[in-house]
């Protein structure tokens, strides 16, 4: 496998109750407006051949398409919670700057290419979506990269 | 209350088919996967197979030619289909749910096993 | 695939005492192993995951440390019902392996 380096976020980025509670009000907020609930971005399938120890890597993927072709577009709707939610996810998406894999990651890209998609085939509703599903990833950025 | 159980015939002749069934309870087919792993008496565990909740299939290569996992959404349960069976195949065949979609190859609940013995 | 290397195959220690369980993987698989605890007559059950993260339901006497190749499972202030078999898993990549078993028992 790959070997990944820099790919690690301090625990206290993801201890901070009141940015927490702000993503999930964000996600809640949005998944309330989501209507497409047959189709799940960050699921089983986004790892579907990632080893645990790739994972990382990949949700900091997912992490910068998010803000760059979900959460910067829409920055103006689910306010004030957007306005806090985005410059946090910046500073997470700029500590994994660092972030490499050593090798070929081409299987990463695929599962990362399909999510993109995904998204873009939704148009409008697959952005809602990908901000209804903050709360996962927050989480599977805790889990990958702690 | 997450729940699996394994049933399925104790003795199958040998080059025969053996063909357990997981049935589940507490849980979603369609939300976790579900893994198959043997237990040779007194002996480690082998992990098979897992069906994804898409219905996806994985197999361990060591069985890839001779194994099928299977599903039945609407009966929640899960089929393991392996033919050839030989007399290394007596064991204890268990199923097990992943933890969660990102802990997906952690194996949380077991079922409390099926024993086969292939004998003829 | 990955080898796990389990030792020791036996462990005989009383009530109250501590005793460590090691697992050795044949590559570096990160954080991401296992522990199970197997008894007869009953569905095995997760202790730990991610080398030393304890799954819900898992008494604080039980706790897991190490990383790349070398984990170890230590448990503290033995119980009566903690004598079983121990089994490690790494959960790093396919196909998951599992260590050949540590069989706790009673002095």
């Known amino acids: 496998a790959p070997i990944s380096s820099h790919c690690r976020l301090d625990k206290s980025n993801f201890q901070q109750p009141y940015i927490t509670n702000r993503t999930f009000m964000l996600a809640k907020e949005a998944s309330l407006a989501d209507n497409n609930t047959d189709v799940r971005l960050i699921g089983e399938k986004l790892f579907h051949g990632v080893s645990m120890s790739e994972r990382c890597y990949l949700m900091k993927q997912v992490l910068n398409f998010t803000l760059e072709e979900v959460l910067f577009p829409q920055s103006d709707r689910f306010q004030p919670y957007m306005q806090e939610v985005v410059p946090f996810l910046a500073r997470l998406s700029n500590r994994l700057s660092t972030c490499h894999i050593e090798g070929d990651d081409l299987h990463i890209q695929r599962n990362v290419q399909k999510l993109k998609d995904t998204v873009k085939k939704l148009g409008e509703s697959g952005e809602i979506k990908a901000i209804g599903e903050l709360d996962l990833l927050f989480m599977s950025l805790r889990n990958a990269c702690i | 209350e997450v729940q699996l159980q394994e049933s399925g015939p104790g003795l199958v002749q040998p080059s025969q088919t053996l063909s357990p069934t997981c049935t589940v309870s507490?849980?979603?087919?369609?939300?976790?996967?579900v893994h198959w792993v043997r237990q040779h008496s007194g002996k480690s565990l082998e992990w098979m197979g897992r069906?994804?909740?898409?219905?996806?299939?994985s197999y361990n290569s060591a069985f890839t030619s001779r194994l099928s996992i299977t599903r039945d959404t609407s009966k929640s349960q899960v089929f393991l289909k392996m033919n050839s069976l030989q007399t290394e195949d007596t064991g204890t065949y268990y199923c097990?749910?992943?933890?969660?979609?990102?802990?997906?190859?952690?194996?949380?609940?077991w079922g409390p096993g099926t024993t086969v013995t292939v004998s003829s | 695939d990955i080898v796990m290397t389990q030792t020791p195959s036996n462990l005989a220690a009383s009530p109250g005492e501590s005793v460590s369980i090691n697992c050795k993987a044949s590559?570096?698989?990160?954080?991401?192993l296992a522990w199970y605890q197997q008894k007869p007559g009953k569905a095995n059950k997760l202790l730990i995951y991610?080398?030393?993260t304890l799954q819900s339901g898992t008494p604080s006497r039980f706790s897991g440390s190490g990383s790349s190749t070398d984990f170890t499972l230590t448990i503290r202030n033995l119980e009566p019902e903690d004598f079983g078999l121990y089994y490690c898993?790494?959960?790093?990549?396919?196909?998951?392996?599992f260590g050949s078993g540590t069989k706790l028992e009673i002095k």
């Open positions: 898993q790494q959960h790093n990549e396919y196909p998951l392996t």
């Open positions: 590559k570096t698989i990160s954080k991401y």
């Open positions: 097990a749910r992943s933890l969660d979609f990102y802990y997906d190859t952690t194996l949380a609940f």
């Open positions: 991610s080398g030393s």
């Open positions: 507490g849980f979603s087919l369609t939300s976790y996967s």
């Open positions: 069906m994804w909740s898409d219905g996806d299939t």
